[in-house]
Interface confidence: low
């Protein structure tokens, strides 16, 4: 007998608003395989079961996060495969302040990523870059996390803000700094970048 899950990964990241189908199938040497998904929250996707296969459709809602397990059995023999589903939101919505930097004076720069999920410091990281390198001498302050005001009800999205206390930019001043925000997900790394021009 054969037991297959497609996609075969044990962890899957799904962008909010996009759909994903996970197909679990099994064939038996004799008789028809019984295949079903278990460990599903009532709101986690919809399941279409066919002889020998079961299709879990995830709609890319934040409530779809979970770890369903596909179970296939031939008679008394059974096999299982769990899939950790993480729904994420990481739009390109970075806001920096101030809009530009002034050389020759100390200043504080903030960078805010809006409408994100998960709002987890372990999965989201900020960097202040000069070219492709982190800006030396920039002092990272305590990050802040706030719930976004939602137009419609649902699982809340968050905004995360990182501030840095900058040293005086030397002369000649660089043309710009960049705030870079990286979201690290299972087998997926996403990055957004926003320029902060320097007045010349």
């Amino acid at each position: 007998q054969s037991f297959q899950v497609n996609p075969p990964e044990s962890e899957v990241a799904v962008a909010m608003g996009t759909s994903l189908q996970i197909t679990c199938s099994m064939s038996c040497d004799e008789g028809v395989a019984r295949v079903h998904w278990r460990g599903l929250d009532t709101s986690l996707g919809s399941v279409q079961t066919l002889p020998g296969s079961s299709i879990l459709s995830v709609r890319g809602m934040l409530s779809d996060t979970g770890t369903p397990v596909c179970v296939g059995s031939c008679g008394s023999r059974s096999f299982q495969h769990s899939v950790k589903i993480l729904v994420y939101a990481f739009p390109d919505q970075l806001v920096v302040s101030p809009e530009f930097l002034v050389p020759g004076q100390d200043q504080v720069v903030s960078c805010t990523a809006h409408n994100i999920w998960p709002a987890d410091p372990n999965s989201l990281s900020f960097a202040l870059l000069l070219g492709e390198q982190r800006l030396e001498g920039a002092q990272a302050l305590e990050p802040e996390q706030e719930e976004e005001i939602q137009e419609a009800e649902g699982t809340p999205l968050f905004r995360m803000t990182q501030r840095w206390r900058l040293p005086s930019l030397g002369t000649p001043a660089p043309p710009a700094l960049h705030c870079q925000v990286t979201m690290q997900l299972p087998k997926l790394v996403l990055t957004h970048r926003k320029e902060i021009p320097v007045l010349q």
């Epitope: 037991f3 044990s10 278990r38 460990g39 929250d41 009532t42 979970g66 770890t67 397990v69 179970v71 059995s73 008394s76 023999r77 059974s78 096999f79 299982q80 495969h81 769990s82 950790k84």
Partner: antibody, heavy 121, light 107 residues
Framework: QVQLVQSGAEVKKPGASVKVSCKAS????????ISWVRQAPGQGLEWMGW????????NYAQKFQGRVTMTRDTSTSTVYMELSSLRSEDTAVYYC??????????????WGQGTLVTVSS | DIQMTQSPSSLSASVGDRVTITCQAS??????LNWYQQKPGKAPKLLIY???SLQSGVPSRFSGSGSGTDFTLTISSLQPEDFATYYC?????????FGQGTKVEIK
């Protein structure tokens, strides 16, 4: 009746690795998944992960990710659990347990006798 | 992770007593709930699976009930061999988690 027989007690130094074996007999090895559960002295039960004897698929608890490796040898119906970078808090009895499909629930029906791993300098 | 909270953590009872142990899950786990008995120096032994199904060979004085988040293990008439530690376990989602245990002692 499935029987799970584990390897003997081990004493290890901090930073070392330990590999515990669990040999299955009396059942269809390839249809089972083997869980590993540990119990520190005087403490409760802690699930570490499982391995499918059928296809070698593993699923580890986040806490042990990167330190634990579960493997199987179908020719000898044996599964192995290797834990690396040992520290004193890894001192525990380590159990293997066979997970058997039963009416939509997956209870650990059969357990090994346990292997005491002591981590001490 | 799903947290499993057992109560009480210990209890004293006499032979013949009716004993009830509760287990609460931090999330809805349907009936993916098992109960184990463990005696000192021994491996756990499965008593109840799927919240209320009695495992083969387990005396009928043991029973389980509940679904969703609240579950109960009942020993209708405590016997001398029942003095042990009892654990609930959820298998609804990975990682599988156990309650902290309930120790049943002789009064």
């Amino acid at each position: 009746q499935v029987q799970l027989v584990q390897s003997g007690a081990e004493v290890k130094k901090p930073g070392a690795s330990v590999k515990v074996s669990c040999k299955a007999s009396g059942g269809t090895f390839s249809s089972s998944a083997i869980s590993w559960v540990r119990q520190a002295p005087g403490q409760g039960l802690e699930w570490m992960g499982w391995i499918s004897a059928y296809n070698g698929y593993t699923n580890y608890a986040q806490k042990f990710q990167g330190r634990v490796t579960m493997t199987r040898d179908t020719s000898t119906s044996t599964v192995y659990m290797e834990l690396s970078s040992l520290r004193s808090e890894d001192t525990a009895v380590y159990y293997c347990a066979s997970r058997v499909h039963s009416g939509g629930s997956y209870p650990d029906d059969y357990w090994g006798q346990g292997t005491l791993v002591t981590v001490s300098s | 992770d799903i947290q499993m909270t057992q109560s009480p953590s210990s209890l004293s009872a006499s032979v013949g007593d009716r004993v009830t142990i509760t287990c609460q899950a931090s999330e809805h786990i349907y009936n993916y709930l098992n109960w184990y008995q463990q005696k000192p120096g021994k491996a756990p032994k499965l008593l109840i699976y799927a919240a209320s199904s009695l495992q083969s060979g387990v005396p009928s004085r043991f029973s389980g009930s509940g679904s969703g988040t609240d579950f109960t293990l009942t020993i209708s008439s405590l016997q001398p061999e029942d003095f042990a530690t009892y654990y609930c376990q959820q298998t609804d989602s990975i990682p599988i988690t156990f309650g902290q245990g309930t120790k049943v002692e002789i009064k």
